[in-house]
Amino acid sequence: FPQTTEKISPNWESGINVDLAISTRQYHLQQLFYRYGENNSLSVEGFRKLLQNIGIDKIKRIHIHHDHDHHSDHEHHSDHERHSDHEHHSEHEHHSDHDHHSHHNHAASGKNKRKALCPDHDSDSSGKDPRNSQGKGAHRPEHASGRRNVKDSVSASEVTSTVYNTVSEGTHFLETIETPRPGKLFPKDVSSSTPPSVTSKSRVSRLAGRKTNESVSEPRKGFMYSRNTNENPQECFNASKLLTSHGMGIQVPLNATEFNYLCPAIINQIDARSCLIHTSEKKAEIPPKTYSLQIAW
């Protein structure tokens, strides 16, 4: 038959490169199934382990004291034992639904007073970002991420990201990193594909959690932190990179089908702890210009 001389003409369905989206989704699914599956199927036990490792197998409440006065440099200690049985409200304290034993990022439960705990002070600014338009029925919930509620409100010059760390003895640490950055936290700000740098001026406060007998469920293959099958550690993708790696434009609202392509990558990124900063036991030191604080969602 005649050989075509035309260029690759991707199947651009609703503005996305479907071939790239499908293959990238399959890649992330393969990573997950390699860790938790058997013969390309996921048993209930494997699925349970996956949920445990991404921290959404059960709900526990911990109380995190946040510094809303951005000039204070002292450490905040959260007494998880003392406050574990009652709600404790003040204008400087917020309650975050984290599974304390899992020491990594979590998908927060929508059932647990999400709005009461973390009111969205930016809800009137949806028009600033083209992704917030209602095109194709897309609607971005403001509290899709468990880390969205770290601060009651985010100032124009600072972003706080809460991440978990672990050390070999089993002590859990909560690390709060505040770093200068103009603009708002995603989902309002999706246009920037470059994550903010954590500079030497960043303040790092570590909250030591209690020792616990509960441990993170290990995946079948024994992966823990960089458990991806590649030799290179998995990169932490922010919103823009997640979209572009699936052949999706960063200015186009997502519909449900398109979001479906992204789901394995999001789960894989959570499970591989790609967006956690692993500091040494002795001190939470972040050399200037070395690490970057990556905000995935």
Epitope: P10, V18, T24, Y27, N232, K241
Partner: antibody, heavy 118, light 112 residues
Framework: EVQLQQSGTVLARPGASVKISCKAS????????MHWVKQRPGQGLEWIGA????????TYNQKFKGKAKLTAVTSASTAYMDLSSLTNEDSAVYYC???????????WGQGTTLTVSS | DVVMTQTPLTLSVTIGQPASISCKSS???????????LNWLLQRPGQSPKRLIY???KLDSGVPDRFTGSGSGTDFTLKISRVEAEDLGVYYC?????????FGGGTKLEIK
């Protein structure tokens, strides 16, 4: 015109390593995964693995883990496959291909013949 | 991995006569968007493989309409309404539902 231009025939000794290249032209290299396929003489097609040049994610057929290593240099629009610890079983034609699922076009390189012989 | 099983192994057909090749997958190739990721390829003697059909039944550019693909789920068929001399070679089905990609063992079409 889209082309996947592969490096020429390779003769190698058992135990050696070789690097096969695949230069893409006519499309944006970072828009598609690049796949590698093995075909032994008189045999069928066997998928080795694939790389996404946009971020160098790689996925392998378990059979070829440790045997093949895929890399890509986006500035040169070129994908590479390293084959190590060669044996006679590695003698085959190796193809790079876009192996597309939904697009109306699909592209294959002309193949690189590897002969492993002492 | 998804196992792709092709039959027959060899097909001898007279020019102008129809031909049919079957491909069965060990699991459904239906994707979450409702489309089925199955390709058919032809490898002529001494050449690289070339895709003929994608998404079960869509013809690649330049592929004659005497080729038709059909099927769903796990059972697929490639038909050639009237075989021509240039059709000889080995036909492969290939699944695109997951990594690793897998191919059928091939069906060799010979001209009687």
């Amino acid at each position: 015109e889209v082309q996947l231009q592969q490096s020429g025939t390779v003769l190698a000794r058992p135990g050696a390593s070789v690097k096969i290249s695949c230069k893409a032209s006519g499309y944006r290299f970072t828009s598609y995964w690049m796949h590698w396929v093995k075909q032994r003489p008189g045999q069928g097609l066997e998928w080795i693995g694939a790389i996404y040049p946009g971020n160098s994610d790689t996925t392998y057929n378990q059979k070829f883990k440790g045997k093949a290593k895929l890399t890509a240099v986006t500035s040169a629009s070129t994908a590479y496959m390293d084959l190590s610890s060669l044996t006679n079983e590695d003698s085959a034609v190796y193809y790079c291909t876009s192996l597309l699922l939904r697009s109306p076009f699909d592209y294959w390189g002309q193949g690189t013949t590897l002969t492993v012989s002492s | 991995d998804v196992v792709m099983t092709q039959t027959p192994l060899t097909l001898s057909v007279t020019i102008g006569q129809p031909a049919s090749i079957s491909c069965k997958s060990s699991q459904s190739l239906l994707d979450s968007d409702g489309k089925t990721n199955l390709n058919w390829l032809l490898q002529r003697p001494g050449q690289s493989p070339k895709r003929l059909i994608y998404l079960v039944s869509k013809l690649d550019s330049g592929v004659p309409d005497r080729f038709t693909g059909s099927g769903s789920g796990t059972d697929f068929t490639l038909k050639i309404s009237r075989v021509e001399a240039e059709d000889l070679g080995v036909y492969y089905c290939c699944q695109g539902i997951q990594f690793p990609r897998t191919f059928g063992g091939g069906t060799k079409l010979e001209i009687k």
